[in-house]
C-alpha cells in the first residue's frame, strides 16, 4: 500500500500529551526507531512518568483515507466491557505548511491526534519545494514551534553589513518568489531556503535538509546545505551552508531582524533573537486573556465581546464579515455554524461562510504583535478551511468606548486578515522571565 | 501583481507641510512591506519610510525621523506620507513601493512601484 502523504514520510514526528507527560513519536510510512517500541511500531508512546514505552500503532496495520490514518495493533484493551485493541487515530486537514501533529485526547483503546498539512490538502497550491518540520519539543516538553515564522511568499533579508551583497532566507521551507514581479529576490533559484545575492545575479547558499532542532532550552537550530555538486567560484572550494539559530529572549521585546554573526567561506551563521523561539505557552492562549507568571504580560480582550445577538460589521467590499470575538454568541446571519467571524456575500446574503468558528481560537502574542487566530471555518475549494487573523492595536483613544472596530483588510488563500484598534490591545508588561 | 498611484505632492514653502497618498489596487496582501523612496535630481533614489502592512511596525530615514510619518488606512488599501518641516534639501520625486520581503529598506527588493509624485520645497 502506497503512502498516503508522501512529503511527511522522510521524518519521525513527535506530539505530546502534556497532561499525562507523554512523548509520542510517529513515523506514518515506515517505523519509528525505538528498540522499546518492536521494529514496526509506527506510533510509540513513552510515558516519562513510569519511563515505559508503549506500542500504540503498527506500521504494518494500517489503515487510510485521503483524511484519516489509522493504525491498529494487536494489544488487546476494554472499552466498556468490548473486546478492542489498541490504536492510534490521525485526522488530517489542510493546513498551509507541513504542520505538527497535535495530541488531542487518548482513550483506554485510542489515541487520537489532528495534524493541519499541506499534505492533505485537495490541491498543491500551499506546497513547497523542500519543507520540513519547523517544531521541537525541549527536554520539558514544552513545544517551540517556528510554523508562524514560515512565509508561503517572500523572505526575510538578513541585516548583514556587505553593502554588496543581500542574503534573504525563508523559515524551514524554500522562497516562493513567483507572487514578486520585480525585484532582486526574482532572480533566486528555486528551491533555495538561503538566496545570496550579489549585483544582478542570485545563488542558492543553501536549501533545508533536516528539521528544526533544539540546542538549549531557548535557543533552536535550522541548518542549511546546497544540495547539488558544483562549487561556487567565490567559495574557495567549500559548499555553501547556512545556520540559523533562532534565540529566545530573556524578556518580552518587540521583534528584531535576523543578524549574520559570521562568515567564512560561504558558511554563513544567523543569530535571530525572536519570541517565536520561547516555548508555545508562552506566546499562546485559546482564551482571550495572556496572563500570569508564565507570560511575562496581562493581556484581556474578553470586553470585546458582544452580548445580546449583536456584532462587529466590517466591510469587505463583495463580503460583509460578522465579528463576535472572545465568546460563544452565535452569529444571527450565520446558520448555527459557530462561527466567531461570519462572510456574507452582499450580492446574495444566502451565501454564508464560516470563516473562523470560536471554539478554534488562539490568542497570540509574540515579537510585539498581537494577534487573534480563529480558524477551522467552511472549506474553500483547495480543501483549506476558512480562517481569520486579527492583528491587535493598542489605542487608547479608540471609539466605541474604547473597543474601537474591526477593519478588514485583505484576503489570501482563504484567510481574512483584519486590524483592530482598541484600548484593550495595550499590553501592560512584567519583568521576570 | 499591486497596482501603486500617488498622489499629493506639489509645491511648498520651506517649514511647511505635505501629506501624500499611495493607493494599492491589486492582491495586496501578498506584500508585506510598504516603503516610500524619493529620488532628487542627478540622486540615487533612497529610502525615506517603510511600514508593515498587518502591523503598525514602521522605519525612517534618519534624515526625517521626527519629521515625517508613514501611516496606512487598511480600509482604503492607501498609505500615507506625512511630511512637516519641509527642507529645500526634501525637494525629489516620491514614489511609493511594496516589497514581499520583510526587514529591508533596500530599493532593489521592492518589485511594485508607483509613477512618483513630484515634492518642491522653495521660497
Known amino acids: 500500500q502506497a503512502a498516503p502523504f508522501p512529503e511527511l514520510c522522510s521524518y519521525t514526528w513527535e506530539a505530546v500529551d502534556t497532561k499525562n507527560n507523554v512523548l509520542y513519536k510517529i513515523n506514518i510510512c515506515g517505523s519509528v526507531d525505538i528498540v522499546q517500541c518492536g521494529p514496526s511500531s509506527a506510533v510509540c508512546m513513552h510515558d516519562l512518568d513510569t519511563r515505559t514505552y508503549h506500542s500504540v500503532g503498527d506500521s504494518v496495520l494500517r489503515s487510510a483515507t485521503r483524511s484519516l490514518l489509522e493504525f491498529n495493533t494487536t494489544v488487546s484493551c476494554d472499552q466498556q466491557g468490548t473486546n478492542h485493541r489498541v490504536q492510534s487515530s490521525i485526522a488530517f486537514l489542510c493546513g498551509k505548511t507541513l504542520g505538527t501533529p497535535e495530541f488531542v485526547t487518548a482513550t483506554e483503546c485510542v489515541h487520537y491526534f489532528e495534524w493541519r498539512t499541506t499534505a492533505a490538502c485537495k490541491k498543491d497550491i500551499f506546497k513547497a519545494n523542500k519543507e520540513v518540520p519547523c517544531y521541537v519539543f525541549d527536554e520539558e516538553l514544552r513545544k517551540h514551534d517556528l510554523n508562524p515564522l514560515i512565509k508561503l511568499s517572500g523572505a526575510y533579508l538578513v541585516d548583514d553589513s556587505d553593502p554588496d551583497t543581500s542574503l534573504f532566507i525563508n523559515v524551514c521551507r524554500d522562497i516562493d518568489t513567483l507572487r514578486d514581479p520585480g525585484s532582486q529576490l526574482r532572480a533566486c533559484p528555486p528551491g533555495t531556503a538561503a538566496c545570496l545575492v550579489r549585483g544582478h545575479q542570485a545563488f542558492d547558499v543553501g536549501q533545508p535538509r533536516d528539521g528544526l532542532k533544539v540546542v538549549r532550552k531557548d535557543r533552536l537550530v535550522l541548518s542549511y546545505v546546497r544540495e547539488e555538486a558544483g562549487k561556487l567560484d567565490f567559495c574557495d572550494g567549500h559548499s555553501p551552508a547556512v545556520t540559523i539559530t533562532f534565540v529566545c529572549p530573556s524578556e518580552r521585546r518587540e521583534g528584531t531582524i535576523p543578524k549574520l554573526t559570521a562568515k567564512s567561506n560561504c558558511r554563513y551563521e544567523i543569530e535571530w533573537i525572536t519570541e517565536y523561539a520561547c516555548h508555545r505557552d508562552y506566546l499562546e492562549s485559546k482564551t482571550c486573556s495572556l496572563s500570569g507568571e508564565q507570560q511575562d504580560v496581562s493581556i484581556d480582550l474578553t470586553p470585546l465581546a458582544q452580548s445580546g445577538g449583536s456584532s462587529y460589521i466590517s466591510d469587505g467590499k463583495e463580503y460583509l464579515f460578522y465579528l463576535n470575538v472572545c465568546g460563544e454568541t452565535e452569529i444571527q446571519f450565520c446558520n448555527k455554524k459557530q462561527a466567531a467571524v461570519c462572510q456574507v456575500k452582499k450580492s446574495d446574503t444566502s451565501q454564508v461562510k464560516a470563516a473562523g468558528r470560536y471554539h478554534n481560537q488562539t490568542l497570540r502574542y509574540s515579537d510585539g504583535d498581537l494577534t487573534l487566530i480563529y480558524f477551522g471555518g467552511d472549506e474553500c475549494s483547495s480543501g483549506f478551511q476558512r480562517m481569520s487573523v486579527i492583528n491587535f492595536e493598542c489605542n487608547k483613544t479608540a471609539g466605541n468606548d474604547g473597543k474601537g472596530t474591526p477593519v478588514f483588510t485583505g484576503e489570501v488563500d482563504c484567510t481574512y486578515f483584519f486590524t483592530w484598534d482598541t484600548e484593550y490591545a495595550c499590553v501592560h508588561h512584567h519583568h521576570h522571565h | 501583481d499591486v497596482q501603486l498611484v500617488e498622489s499629493g505632492g506639489g509645491l511648498v514653502q520651506p517649514g511647511g507641510s505635505l501629506r501624500l497618498s499611495c493607493a494599492a489596487s491589486?492582491?495586496?496582501?501578498?506584500?508585506?512591506?510598504w516603503g516610500w523612496f524619493r529620488q532628487a535630481p542627478g540622486k540615487e533614489r533612497e529610502f525615506v519610510a517603510a511600514?508593515?502592512?498587518?502591523?503598525?511596525?514602521?522605519s525612517y530615514a534618519d534624515s526625517v525621523k521626527g519629521r515625517f510619518t508613514i501611516s496606512r488606512d487598511n480600509a482604503k488599501n492607501t498609505i500615507y506620507l506625512q511630511m512637516n518641516s519641509l527642507r529645500p534639501e526634501d525637494t525629489a520625486v516620491y514614489y511609493c513601493?511594496?516589497?514581499?520581503?520583510?526587514?529591508?529598506?533596500?530599493?532593489?527588493?521592492?518589485?511594485?512601484w508607483g509613477q512618483g509624485t513630484l515634492v518642491t520645497v522653495s521660497s
Open positions: 513601493a511594496a516589497s514581499i520581503v520583510d526587514f529591508t529598506t533596500n530599493p532593489s527588493h521592492f518589485g511594485s
Open positions: 491589486g492582491r495586496t496582501f501578498n506584500t508585506y512591506n
Open positions: 511600514i508593515r502592512w498587518s502591523s503598525s511596525k514602521t
